[in-house]
Amino acid sequence: YDFTNCDFEKIKAAYLSTISKDLITYMSGTKSTEFNNTVSCSNRPHCLTEIQSLTFNPTAGCASLAKEMFAMKTKAALAIWCPGYSETQINATQAMKKRRKRKVTTNKCLEQVSQLQGLWRRFNRPLLKQQ
């Protein structure tokens, strides 16, 4: 999906009002400097691409974050403020339902969400170019 035509300010507002709190709650108990920041993004569409990938794509050691509160709110924000986004996700959602696993917070998931916090922080930068 090409995130170029999203309403970035509305997504930013959704992040500041709720998603950020849910990320904080997920990370509760984690040490501030436990994880290095290794994922970056250069503009807002790129940030959303990376956010979508880390939030919804299973990775080794972290089967799924998609049912977490921050992920569901991220999905809702993208569906509302990115034209055509929800249509592209129907097939992906069907596939995810088939392989959903028991929800377990692993260290790898915490590291992944730490990277997500960094990506969201970059997305919110007022001077970050749109494209």
């Epitope: 400097t33 436990e34 994880f35 290095n36 920041n37 730490s114 916090q117």
Partner: antibody, heavy 118, light 107 residues
Framework: QVQLLQPGTELVKPGASVKLSCKAS????????MHWVKQRPGQGLEWIGE????????DYNQNFRGKATLTVDMSSSTAYMQLSSLTSEDSAVYYC???????????WGQGTTLTVSS | DIVMTQSHKFMSTSVGDRVNITCKAS??????VAWYQQKPGQSPKLLIY???MRHTGVPDRFTGSGSGTDFTLTISNVQSEDLADYFC?????????FGSGTKLEIK
Amino acid sequence: QVQLLQPGTELVKPGASVKLSCKASGYTFTSYLMHWVKQRPGQGLEWIGEIDPSDSYTDYNQNFRGKATLTVDMSSSTAYMQLSSLTSEDSAVYYCALTGTINYFDYWGQGTTLTVSS
Amino acid sequence: DIVMTQSHKFMSTSVGDRVNITCKASQDVVTAVAWYQQKPGQSPKLLIYWASMRHTGVPDRFTGSGSGTDFTLTISNVQSEDLADYFCQQYSSFTFTFGSGTKLEIK
């Protein structure tokens, strides 16, 4: 181990500028955010702003925009804070402090005592 | 900005006593609260993060509790070396803010 080294004192005249330093060691400089915190004598702590050494992006407390400018020198793993148009209100201890993506401060410098006096 | 209020500027206690230092946030900060100890002439030191997690090397007589808007740092069996200023800080929302501090005095 992580260390943040700051000079002990700076004495500057009113109206002048000063550049405070914070030399980091014991970790990868670009991995974490560097913050600056102000403490006036006998008072509380006030967050000034943060800089991401990986790309020099800064965020400031609104109260310090135009007063403080944060920079880094990658070659020496040193963070700087320049304070401009100094007045007696700027006399304080200034700390650098370190965080990851979660913004509480596990590591602090020893602080630089800035005195603004003619 | 979120205001962190420490209603007691000073608290007096005796060695061996138990003392509660409180901090109130002006809005919900979940459990994103840290506590710092600052001894005279020193930089602040992290005691507690995530409202109740003890930082490495902090004696277990220091305990944090609370969530939402009300937070407490409890020092049980107070020692003379606990004479210090104690600050709370919220990191739930930008701008990160501190309480004004509570000075613990030993009788």
